[in-house]
């Protein structure tokens, strides 16, 4: 906290400029005002502040604004917005996209901190939902931060958000994650046809139930290895060997080097090995010649 | 054959909430995608959200935003809309819609439950 | 906000051909679905993905998809075909139908 003390004689600030970096923390306190300082908060970012003297700064504009500082104030806070504290920007409310790319570009380059996560979630409730801008913006700058997100919060991405999302933004998703924006996704490209759909839904089928791969398996994508071994193995054990050929197309062959993993493992498991040797890729381990399978999950189903 | 049972006709006060239920009958209603739509009197249809057969993602026409609410319970085979904060306009008929014709891209709703009217009225 | 544009009615003589036009920016580009609805009734649905026809559909319904129009085509009008006709598609986050256009057999 910085004393209060008179201004010496001459040295009012008329201005925000560089003459203020040789001010002391308590002549900046006595002598720059505060509403000067918002209205000229865009020249901040060009003089070299010392982090003490940014302090300085920060106090008068929390002194001018204790509900909260206006966005006009905001979108320019620049490097202070590192000294804020997520308490501080609680009271904001940010509605422009400008303000909040503005704000990320300070943190460049950095960890999500604690202040750019709230400062994310203030925007998106302002918004109500996670907007396409809004979320091209983020995983601009954050890659990972659709998966960041818990299956509730999800939940409120429109589809049309989903034609911003790589294939990269989604690496670090849970299955949880995939159930909850697989079928946006789905809505998303339902107007596209075979293998246009089948590029775009990709990232996203490991939140494919069994139906969908089986509609798939009709269609001739030639889905490959990398992404077959992502499928919830829930979803991949039901299909029969002669739909995992179709789904996979040439890229069936790969199978033999993953069936340790899973879910082929469990996969080659459920299946009968008159009908794996049918792919002559020497899978071994399923279901011998004349035993009998029993599915006691249908039958739970119908008890 | 199929069928999409809904619940009884309900009276709201305007600012109350009512929730609608639609219970499949004859075949496995978990698969499935169940939409909403609506039909005010003399109106045509509008729709207004839809759920995804484990229950886990919903999506919801802009309008009714932050005001419906679907959920589903695959215990017993029922889904639910909830709309909060009625005014007399929601005055409509409210359907539920299964999409059970498969394929990869196709979400066309071809079983329908047989509506159930609610009216708000002070 | 996207909209789909259909005639308020349309009428046609049994045995004729019923035509009913859905319009809407780059429809084509889309699906397009088509309803049936009698009075104090569920909608039925009659074509989807533009051509396609349900199980139970008769034979003369069909549709067509491009540029900006979708059309369902009733050949062959039967008095059963009398009802509210509804088209729709998905645009951006949002399923629309269209105005609803009531078909009339003479």
């Known amino acids: 906290e910085v004393e209060k003390t008179a201004c010496p004689s001459g040295k009012k600030a008329r201005e925000i400029d560089e003459s203020l970096i040789f001010y002391k923390k308590w002549e900046l306190e006595a002598c720059v005002d505060a509403a000067l300082l918002a209205t000229q908060m865009d020249r901040v970012n060009a003089i070299p502040f010392t982090y003490e003297q940014l302090d300085v700064l920060k106090h008068k504009l929390d002194e001018l604004y204790p509900q909260g500082y206006p966005e006009s104030v905001i979108q320019h806070l620049g490097y202070l917005f590192l000294k804020m504290s997520p308490e501080d920007i609680r009271k904001w409310n940010v509605t422009s996209l400008e303000t909040l790319k503005a704000l990320l570009e300070v943190n460049k380059g950095h960890e999500m901190s604690p202040q750019v996560a709230t400062l994310i979630d203030r925007f998106v409730k302002g918004r109500g939902q996670l907007d396409k801008d809004t979320l091209d913006t983020l995983t601009a700058f954050y890659p990972g931060y659709l998966c960041s997100l818990s299956p509730e919060e999800l939940s409120s991405v429109p589809p049309s958000s989903i034609w911003a999302v790589r294939p990269q933004d989604l690496d670090t998703c849970d299955p949880r994650q995939l159930d909850v924006l697989y079928p946006k996704a789905r809505l998303a490209f339902q107007n596209m046809n075979g293998s246009e759909y089948f590029v775009k839904i990709q990232s996203f089928l490991g939140g494919a139930p069994t139906e969908d791969l089986k509609a798939l398996s009709q269609q001739n994508v030639s889905m490959d290895l990398a992404t077959f071994m992502k499928l919830r193995t829930d979803a991949v054990l039901p299909l029969t060997v002669a739909e995992v050929q179709k789904l996979l197309g040439p890229h069936v062959e790969g199978l033999k080097a993953e069936e340790r993993h899973r879910p082929v493992r469990d996969w080659i498991l459920r299946q009968r090995q008159d009908d794996l040797d049918t792919l002559g890729l020497g899978l071994q381990g399923g279901i011998p010649n004349g035993y009998l399978v029993l599915d006691l999950s249908m039958q739970e189903a119908l008890s | 054959e199929v069928q999409l049972v809904q619940s009884g006709a309900e009276v709201k006060k305007p600012g109350a909430s009512v929730k609608v239920s639609c219970k499949a009958s004859?075949?496995?209603?978990?698969?499935?995608?169940v939409h909403w739509v609506r039909q005010a009197p003399g109106q045509g249809l509008e729709w207004m959200g839809i759920i995804n057969p484990s229950g886990v993602s919903t999506t919801y026409a802009q309008k009714f935003q932050g005001r419906v609410t679907m959920t589903r319970d695959t215990s017993t085979s029922t889904v639910y809309m909830e709309l909060s904060s009625l005014r007399s306009e929601d005055t409509a008929v409210y359907y539920c819609?299964?999409?059970?014709?498969?394929?990869?891209?196709?979400?066309?709703?071809?079983?329908w439950g047989q509506g159930t009217l609610v009216t708000v009225s002070s | 906000s996207y909209e789909l544009t259909q005639p308020p009615s349309v009428s046609v003589s049994p045995g004729q051909t019923a035509s009913i036009t859905c319009s809407g920016d780059?429809?084509?580009?889309?699906?397009a679905s088509w309803y049936q609805q009698k009075p104090g009734q569920s909608p039925v649905l009659v074509i989807y993905?533009?051509?396609r026809r349900p199980s139970g559909i008769p034979e003369r319904f069909s549709g067509s998809n491009s540029g900006n129009t979708a059309t369902l085509t009733i050949s062959g009008t039967q008095a059963m075909d009398e009802a509210d006709y509804y088209c729709?598609?998905?645009?951006?986050?949002?399923?629309?139908f269209g105005t609803g256009t009531k078909v009339t057999v003479l």
């Open positions: 993905q533009d051509n």
């Open positions: 819609a299964e999409s059970r014709i498969p394929g990869y891209n196709n979400f066309a709703m071809d079983v």
């Open positions: 780059k429809l084509g580009d889309k699906y």
């Open positions: 004859g075949d496995t209603f978990n698969r499935y995608y």
């Open positions: 729709q598609a998905w645009d951006s986050d949002t399923y629309v």
